[in-house]
Amino acid sequence: VPDKTVRWCAVSEHEATKCQSFRDHMKSVIPSDGPSVACVKKASYLDCIRAIAANEADAVTLDAGLVYDAYLAPNNLKPVVAEFYGSKEDPQTFYYAVAVVKKDSGFQMNQLRGKKSCHTGLGRSAGWNIPIGLLYCDLPEPRKPLEKAVANFFSGSCAPCADGTDFPQLCQLCPGCGCSTLNQYFGYSGAFKCLKDGAGDVAFVKHSTIFENLANKADRDQYELLCLDNTRKPVDEYKDCHLAQVPSHTVVARSMGGKEDLIWELLNQAQEHFGKDKSKEFQLFSSPHGKDLLFKDSAHGFLKVPPRMDAKMYLGYEYVTAIRNLREGTCPEAPTDECKPVKWCALSHHERLKCDEWSVNSVGKIECVSAETTEDCIAKIMNGEADAMSLDGGFVYIAGKCGLVPVLAENYNKSDNCEDTPEAGYFAIAVVKKSASDLTWDNLKGKKSCHTAVGRTAGWNIPMGLLYNKINHCRFDEFFSEGCAPGSKKDSSLCKLCMGSGLNLCEPNNKEGYYGYTGAFRCLVEKGDVAFVKHQTVPQNTGGKNPDPWAKNLNEKDYELLCLDGTRKPVEEYANCHLARAPNHAVVTRKDKEACVHKILRQQQHLFGSNVTDCSGNFCLFRSETKDLLFRDDTVCLAKLHDRNTYEKYLGEEYVKAVGNLRKCSTSSLLEACTFRRP
């Protein structure tokens, strides 16, 4: 019989008492085969973290700073359940740490030196740890003690709870630095008042502070937020302009064998029976013998943290950067305006080989990082382990939802001004063998399908989106008799046609021979009835253009396109017979790396782009024997995006809507994780 006990860790006598009450009340409402609670008492949260790591306890609820400690080796804990605040309809699991300034003050984030600062309190998250952590490497040396460095960075501050004797500048704007509401500039509202009164130039608070203190929109419009990219935004645009997005209070568990499903089952049942306004005798979110015992008193309920989300992703790049800077206190030798090498994310070992050759030729400008799937690469870019990669539009959508931005677009047509003219896109098509003359768009049911990969534009999002509109369900594996759609569940009929060996079968990378445009076309040639690819795929792999044994004798005339009106046309008539226009592949990165990625890639394409004529004796960035490694092989250049610099603007309203409609069919664990952080 599986052990269905969750050992909750308590850090005080009062918590232990509430835990026992929790245990007893759960026993009374949950069947004997359901989850149960046991209580483990430890002296501190850090002891609880160690106990969970050592399998002496299973769960504890932590503030963001401790979630970071819990994630560090050797603890390796992960977030599994989040408390939410507000309403069930609009649950808030995160708050945003922001830098508020007066509208007419005219300076940016990188011009804070010498300004006057208002903090909620020394050592507090939004008011100190996050802003000072992010500014850490700009502080004057020596950076220890930290208070002295901060005092020398700003021209005056109010940092309640600081030592006014040792660091008088930190108390300059609020004599005495009182550590309670007796100090008019203490806490969130106090720090905002410090700015409002004109004592300070910037207040480090949370996003809700300004709304709580200024009910009138006209008053709020006198303030702005400083963004990390050295721009400003209105105060209601905090989701796009903040220092960090911070989880409020989170249940953590072991990453391996952590009972996360059981913990969720327990807490979900607990909130049903003992949540807000549920029961008089025991209340989960109430602490008669103290404050915030086991859970925050202000919590309204629990939400399950998506399984794909580790602590780094949950806490977010900015928060992790700030806390790591404060804890480790390491900065680059001397901050320079020069760009650090761009860490390119390579999929599997084939892309890694090409990336390595690029890295050797780039003379220190490009480094390589490997991952097994595109989603793993996106996650690595999010958390700073990698910086950039080029993505199909379907993954530009996911990357965008995860906070990444497009920075350059692949262009596929030769033109005089290639780098300045991003193209409208390419065509997504459905290809069949000419010999299968009875096959049309209207009778694909029961046929064998070949897809570039799940989540990609031409191979999945466009054809499956159109199909979904017709069949109104997501069971595509039942619609087709079998197929190869790399990235599908291994036991799905949409992995049956795939050719990868062993663990590589149906993997969404080049270890699966039927992956990508060329792979999907090969799948059609060898096994399938229809392939969903781009309009250039057939000509690029026929007429001897692809020397691989399976392709070298193929003839373009032996293939036709399926049109949406039920007719068929020759391959060259793609402009009048396609499924939809697809946005070109684009390079994505984090916002903080945007300028450097743009600069370095433009240098790199001038050195190794399509101006290189002899690819046998020179490194060519856009060549890989029809395998589309790192970039599509038909890329002519990487083009500036001009104002199409967000994923929505880049992909276009129509495509974003189409992918949004297909979201209900999404199997993307990363998309689920990212929409948890930003619904």
Epitope: V360, N361, G617, F619, E625, L629
Partner: nanobody
């Protein structure tokens, strides 16, 4: 297509040195990039050092300052001078010229380097 044969590996004590050679069956003068990779048991193959025709070099962080890659186009040979060897340098070392493309899973026999006391 140029064939490459690695040699020069062996057993060496920590702190010791070895010089690996990679002999090509044809001219390497027109080959742009050549590199040494290594693979330890149960690990992925990783880039150790690379060199371009113009002499630009790149090293893995773990070998910087200890290993030196060079090429002699007249002798059609690629070298890897390995000093201050550590137990974690133990692996099979391979050379490549990338000319078979990134997709061919062709690697030579390699040469075993074992660093142990």
């Amino acid at each position: 297509e140029v064939q490459l044969v690695e040699c020069g590996g062996g057993l060496v004590q920590p702190g010791g040195s070895l010089r690996l050679s990679c002999a090509a069956s044809g001219s390497i003068a027109s080959i742009n990039t050549m590199a040494w990779y290594r693979q330890a048991p149960g690990q992925q193959r990783e880039l150790v050092a690379g060199i371009t025709r113009g002499g630009s070099t790149k090293y893995a962080d773990s070998v910087k300052g200890r290993f030196t890659i060079s090429r002699d186009n007249a002798k059609n040979t690629l070298y890897l001078q390995m000093n201050s060897l550590k137990p974690e340098d133990t692996a099979v070392y391979y050379c490549t010229d990338y000319s078979r493309g990134y997709y061919q899973d062709y690697w030579g026999q390699g040469t075993q380097v074992t660093v142990s006391s």
